[in-house]
Interface confidence: medium
């Protein structure tokens, strides 16, 4: 599923991401935009043999199990395929664990490079939330 901007903002808010660990909803929508272009089925492979999955491009070396990443920790205790569902519950729950891990949203390279320090509220402007 490819979400609309406001559709995703509403879904993320429903799942409790607004101001989760101090990160406003705009941060999460911005991260999803530049990680996956709002596509729940996005997959991207990394040079270390791991793969990033879903709307928030969660990595198989640390957070989920795709059955083929050497040394996978699976800290979210889920199959990576669950992160590709049109229902973003699994991605959100795992993202909450990631953002609580110590580095905050710096764990997402796209957020660090494209969202951090910008007017992230622009990503939810005009949305009926």
């Amino acid at each position: 599923k490819v979400f609309g901007r406001c559709e995703l903002a509403a879904a993320m808010k429903r799942h409790g991401l607004d101001n989760y660990r101090g990160y406003s909803l705009g941060n999460w929508v911005c991260a999803a935009k530049f990680e996956s272009n709002f596509n729940t089925q996005a997959t991207n492979r990394n040079t270390d043999g791991s793969t990033d999955y879903g709307i928030l491009q969660i990595n198989s070396r640390w957070w989920c199990n795709d059955g083929r990443t050497p040394g996978s920790r699976n800290l979210c205790n889920i199959p990576c395929s669950a992160l590709l569902s049109s229902d973003i519950t699994a991605s959100v729950n795992c993202a909450k664990k990631i953002v609580s891990d110590g580095n905050g949203m710096n764990a997402w390279v796209a957020w660090r490079n494209r969202c951090k320090g910008t007017d992230v509220q622009a990503w939810i402007r005009g949305c009926r939330l």
């Epitope: 089925q41 997959t43 492979r45 040079t47 043999g49 795709d66 059955g67 083929r68 990443t69 050497p70 199959p79 990576c80 395929s81 590709l84």
Partner: antibody
Framework: QVQLQESGAEVMKPGASVKISCKAT????????IEWVKQRPGHGLEWIGE????????YYNEKFKGKATFTADTSSNTAYMQLSSLTSEDSAVYYC?????????WGQGTTLTVSS | DIELTQSPATLSVTPGDSVSLSCRAS??????LHWYQQKPHESPRLLIK???QRASGIPSRFSGSGSGTDFTLSINSVETEDFGMYFC?????????FGGGTKLEIK
């Protein structure tokens, strides 16, 4: 137990297309990548690409882009590979395998012969 | 693409001999190297995963070693059922690639 059952041998004319199937049993089909491998005598094993059935996400070896197309039907736990514009170079045994980085589980292979 | 070069192409041995098969990668692949055995008209069979881990059900006479670019599959006291083709495969990057194979034949 995990099993991958491929469709039977095919004899096709040059220029035609063929669709090979791989039915998976004994595990959660949507969770694992299905990979496709080509074997020709004297050419060893070649990785064609992969599909994650749960999402339909696909990756292709550049060499096989435009030649192979992967699909999956999660209702029947079956992955498919279509090969188009067949030539004699496509005559080979084609295997599906479960993608665990390594390949512990393989199909029995589908022999494709392209001949006029 | 990562190229895997296997040597020798053919190895003629007598049952009871011990042998080593080599697989060399064109760039470092850490331990992401796997070994397969294939008999005529059969699918490949996984022997060793991640350079040195024996797959389920594989006899202890098979062992693997190496890291980086140079890898070895060793068979201690070859048995008649061990004859066939042996392939290595890397999973360090895409596309996945295989070596050209080593044929283990009876002398």
């Amino acid at each position: 137990q995990v099993q991958l059952q491929e469709s039977g041998a095919e004899v096709m004319k040059p220029g035609a297309s063929v669709k090979i199937s791989c039915k998976a049993t004994g595990y959660t089909f949507t969770t694992y990548w299905i990979e496709w491998v080509k074997q020709r005598p004297g050419h060893g094993l070649e990785w064609i690409g992969e599909i994650l059935p749960g999402s339909g996400s696909t990756y292709y070896n550049e060499k096989f882009k435009g030649k192979a197309t992967f699909t999956a039907d999660t209702s029947s736990n079956t992955a498919y590979m279509q090969l188009s514009s067949l030539t004699s170079e496509d005559s080979a045994v084609y295997y599906c395998a479960r993608g665990d980085g390594f390949y512990y589980y393989w199909g029995q292979g589908t022999t494709l012969t392209v001949s006029s | 693409d990562i190229e895997l070069t296997q040597s020798p192409a053919t190895l003629s041995v007598t049952p009871g001999d011990s042998v080593s098969l080599s697989c060399r990668a064109s760039q470092s692949i850490s331990n992401n190297l796997h070994w397969y055995q294939q008999k005529p008209h059969e699918s490949p069979r996984l022997l060793i995963k991640y350079a040195s881990q024996r797959a389920s059900g594989i006899p202890s006479r098979f062992s693997g070693s190496g890291s980086g670019t140079d890898f070895t599959l060793s068979i201690n006291s070859v048995e008649t059922e061990d004859f066939g083709m042996y392939f290595c495969q890397q999973s360090n990057s895409w596309p996945r690639t295989f070596g050209g194979g080593t044929k283990l034949e009876i002398k």
